[in-house]
């Protein structure tokens, strides 16, 4: 990877081991846990990052109301199975043979079952709503400045094409970033909205995945934007299938 050539490191993924063992002695970086070679000029898939993480030695509503089908990642961390492209396999199972189906961002979208559970396809998450609450500031941020800064962040830091940042909503102290990306819209080489959202989530938590870069220093017109709570909602192209028992719980 040209991005990793000089001193054989991976700028976009610190959860790698890099070695001059690629073709012709070129630098090659492999994700921890899976051993898959990653492209260090772009973001690494969330599945490979989660696998690496598990293996590493751990009023007037202008805001969007998440749809009834929106998923929140309540299950937390698990050691996922990734396919040869680095994507989540549709069916995930734990060591005790409990299985469930996930969407393209690895969030469970069915009840848990046993090894007989079938997950026919990996359902794409096409809409992600990132819901942030910022720490109190002297005054509200200017909405258009905030919008511009967040769009710049996703474009420059996460290399996400601007067309996939659908909207930025602001109602102090709540900020919502909407990412939308249908299967038909995503071209080869495009960063996946799920991967961009995961990098952003880790940045916000002060757990940057980028090699050697300082943590995320978000400023709007010089004013620090400090996030104190993050909630991420995932909307799939096909609604999730949970039993009524869960829905009424």
């Amino acid at each position: 990877h040209t991005a990793a050539q000089d001193n054989c490191t991976c700028p976009t993924n610190k959860m790698t081991v890099c070695s001059p063992d690629g073709p012709g002695g070129r630098c090659q970086c492999r994700a921890l846990g899976s051993g898959m070679a990653v492209d260090c000029s772009t973001l690494t898939s969330k599945c490979l990052l989660l696998k690496a993480r598990m293996s590493a030695p751990k009023n007037a509503r202008t805001l969007v109301r998440p749809s009834e089908h929106a998923l929140v990642d309540n299950d937390g961390l698990y050691d996922p199975d990734c396919d040869p492209e680095g994507r989540f396999k549709a069916r995930q199972c734990n060591q005790t043979s409990v299985c469930w189906c996930v969407n393209s961002v690895g969030v469970r979208r069915t009840d848990k079952g046993d090894l007989s559970l079938r997950c026919d396809e990996l359902v794409r998450t096409h809409h992600i709503l990132i819901d942030l609450r910022h720490r109190p500031t002297a005054g509200a941020f200017n909405h258009s400045d905030l919008d511009a800064e967040l769009r710049r962040l996703f474009r420059e830091r996460y290399r996400l094409h601007p067309k996939f940042v659908a909207a930025v909503h602001y109602e102090q102290p709540t900020i919502q970033i909407e990412l939308r990306q249908n299967t038909s819209q995503k071209a080869a080489g495009d960063v996946d909205i799920g991967d961009a959202a995961y990098y952003f989530e880790r940045d916000i938590k002060g757990e940057s995945l980028f090699q050697g870069r300082g943590g995320l220093d978000l400023r709007v017109r010089g004013e620090p934007l400090q996030v104190e709570r993050t909630l991420i909602y995932y909307l799939d192209e096909i609604p999730p299938k949970f039993s009524m028992k869960r829905l009424t719980a």
């Epitope: 081991v17 073709p23 070679a37 040869p84």
Partner: antibody, heavy 116, light 113 residues
Framework: QVQLVQSGPEVVKPGASVKISCKAS????????LGWVKQAPGQGLEWIGN????????NYNEKFKGKATLTADTSTSTAYMELSSLRSEDTAVYFC?????????WGQGTLLTVSS | DIVMTQSPDSLAVSLGERATINCKSS????????????LAWYQQKPGQPPKLLIY???TRESGVPDRFSGSGSGTDFTLTISSLQAEDVAVYYC?????????FGQGTKLEIK
């Protein structure tokens, strides 16, 4: 030139443990993955696991977890594989190999015989 | 785990003739990030360690005679020896080093007819 020299043959009793060594020379030991491979008599090749000596990251084939323990001593550029609770089915030639696309470097193999 | 299946298990070819060994993987070995296939071919003679012939599915290791060639992508791969020589008698293995655990094919024994 790159060389991997392994320790000599071992004959051990069932239930015992053994530690095989692999001394590397001719390259920077700490910046390449070093893998271990098993070949039972008349059988094919099985990947046991690998170690990255520079950071001590280790990966195991699930089949060999609890059986093999990989370590490395960077001061002597030597990798080790300890095999425990030995049984007759552990009788095999064990190879160390430098991994990667240009992974043409293998040790000569260490024959381990488990016999009472 | 990725399962590597070689065919045939054994092969007898006349000197100077072409020998072809196939290897099929249960999952794609093509890395979409760098468009490289993580597939290697090894030759092993009795009492010796395996010798790397081909890596990246088609790149010949330095010092390997040009009668050896590799082809294929994704899940289907082929090792071809264009003109068999006596010293090519050996067991040949394909290996995936795409995702842990790395896996080998069961081997193909090549003999002179």
């Amino acid at each position: 030139q790159v060389q991997l020299v392994q320790s000599g043959p071992e004959v051990v009793k069932p239930g015992a443990s053994v530690k095989i060594s692999c001394k590397a020379s001719g390259y920077t030991f700490t910046i390449y993955w070093l893998g271990w491979v098993k070949q039972a008599p008349g059988q094919g090749l099985e990947w046991i696991g690998n170690i990255f000596p520079g950071s001590a990251y280790i990966n195991y084939n699930e089949k060999f977890k609890g059986k093999a323990t990989l370590t490395a001593d960077t001061s002597t550029s030597t990798a080790y594989m300890e095999l425990s609770s030995l049984r007759s089915e552990d009788t095999a030639v064990y190879f160390c190999a430098r991994e990667g696309s240009n992974s043409g470097y293998w040790g000569q193999g260490t024959l381990l015989t488990v016999s009472s | 785990d990725i399962v590597m299946t070689q065919s045939p298990d054994s092969l007898a070819v006349s000197l100077g003739e072409r020998a072809t060994i196939n290897c099929k993987s249960s999952q794609s070995l093509l890395n979409s990030g760098n468009q490289q296939n993580y597939l290697a071919w090894y030759q092993q003679k009795p009492g010796q360690p395996p010798k790397l012939l081909i890596y990246g599915a088609s790149t010949r290791e330095s010092g390997v005679p040009d009668r050896f060639s590799g082809s294929g992508s994704g899940t289907d791969f082929t090792l071809t020896i264009s003109s068999l020589q006596a010293e090519d008698v050996a067991v040949y293995y394909c290996q995936s080093d795409h995702i842990y655990p790395y896996t080998f094919g069961q081997g193909t024994k090549l003999e002179i007819k």
